[in-house]
Interface confidence: low
């Protein structure tokens, strides 16, 4: 396929990536699926600079990112290494809290209202951010 050279309509370009910011809420899995259908993924935050960019656009609202520990260890949806990568958890987080009464712990990460991260119940209907890399080959057929 051809390389994507500019961001789709209604997406925001930043540092060779394109970002789409939802204005409605979905459970984490539905948000993840939404991004995949757009040939993208839930946002993967790899630096303080990217954190500030996303934070500026989402404002002080709970927003899903592409980080989860549903299978045990924390993992980024695009395969970025969690252990050695950028992290911005709130103090005492993640805590896999079980006291919410919804069953299970907390397996999905979101930006909190000050931008730092928290783990929460994946079923909560939070906003989300999709990201796709500009240099990634798109799924569209090449122009002949």
């Amino acid at each position: 396929g051809s390389e994507r050279t500019c961001c789709p309509v209604n997406w925001v370009e930043h540092e060779r990536s394109c970002y789409w910011f939802s204005r409605s809420g979905k459970a984490w899995a539905d948000a993840d699926n939404y991004c995949r259908l757009e040939d993208a993924h839930l946002v993967v935050v790899t630096s303080w600079e990217e954190q500030k960019f996303v934070q500026h656009h989402i404002g002080p609202v709970n927003t899903w990112m592409g980080l989860h520990d549903q299978n045990g260890p924390w993992k980024w949806v695009d395969g970025t290494d969690y252990e050695t990568g950028f992290k911005n958890w709130r103090p005492e987080q993640p805590d896999d809290w079980y006291g919410h009464g919804l069953g299970g712990g907390e397996d999905c990460a979101h930006f909190t209202d000050d931008g730092r991260w928290n783990d929460d119940v994946c079923q909560r209907p939070y906003r989300w951010v999709c990201e796709t890399e500009l240099d990634k080959a798109s799924q569209e057929p090449p122009l002949l």
């Epitope: 809420g25 500030k52 934070q55 002080p60 609202v61 709970n62 103090p91 809290w97 006291g99 919410h100 909190t112 209202d113 000050d114 931008g115 928290n118 929460d120 119940v121 909560r124 939070y126 906003r127």
Partner: antibody, heavy 115, light 107 residues
């Protein structure tokens, strides 16, 4: 328009109790953490308590721990502060404020603890 | 707990003056600092969050900078409605703490 309206303040004797309410409108209440902040007469601002958007996480200032209880009802877009064992030093205007940024504030409700 | 200090505690200035207020945290708070303005008898108003981001509707004469432990709030050209008390606040960790305030009054 974002609005926060506190109520429930008043005059109470030392050792007494009060329940403050904060009615929120104009925003998605269940997406935001909420806070109580107070200001004693002629003094500065003092953070009292915070509660996360879902109510999962709760924090208190040492000065009120064990006496005050913060809670919220997302179905009613309301925040509460139950205050017990009130002391003269709790006399203040109590404000609710939105999010960890404290980006929006109510007008405040005065609490006077005096015999 | 993180202690917040402000200087000066008060200052007298004239309309049109450039005013700078400093805030210091007892330990590093990255950029988790906010500034508030309060006029007598009114609720505080949020001016700036994340150390330097102006809140919506705040005039551009207000600016702020800093990271770690040292922060500044600057009013480039003081207007009559700016005479008030200014507070900084850290939200890096609980308990959230405010500075003692800086009162800006008319010279």
């Amino acid at each position: 328009e974002v609005q926060l309206v506190e109520s429930g303040g008043g005059l109470v004797k030392p050792g007494g109790s009060l329940r403050l309410s904060c009615a929120a409108s104009g925003f998605t209440f269940n997406s935001y953490s909420m806070n109580w902040v107070r200001q004693a007469p002629g003094k500065g601002l003092e953070w009292v308590s915070s509660i996360s958007s879902s109510g999962s996480y709760i924090y208190y200032a040492d000065s009120v721990k064990g006496r005050f209880t913060i809670s919220r009802d997302n179905a009613k877009n309301s925040l509460y502060l139950q205050m017990h064992s009130l002391r003269a030093e709790d006399t203040a205007v109590y404000y609710c404020a939105r999010s960890n940024l404290f980006d929006c504030w109510g007008q405040g409700t005065p609490v006077t603890v005096s015999s | 707990d993180i202690q917040m200090t402000q200087s000066p505690s008060s200052l007298s200035a004239s309309v049109g003056d450039r005013v700078t207020i400093t805030c210091r945290a007892s330990q590093g708070i990255s950029n988790y600092l906010a500034w508030f303005q309060q006029t007598p008898g009114k609720a505080p108003k949020s001016l700036i969050s994340v150390a330097s981001s102006l809140q919506s509707g705040v005039p551009s004469r207000f600016s702020a900078s800093g990271s770690g432990t040292d922060f500044t709030l600057t009013i480039s050209s003081l207007q009559p409605e700016d005479f008030a008390t200014y507070y900084c606040r850290q939200y890096h960790s609980y308990p959230f703490t405010f500075g003692p305030g800086t009162k800006v009054d008319i010279k």
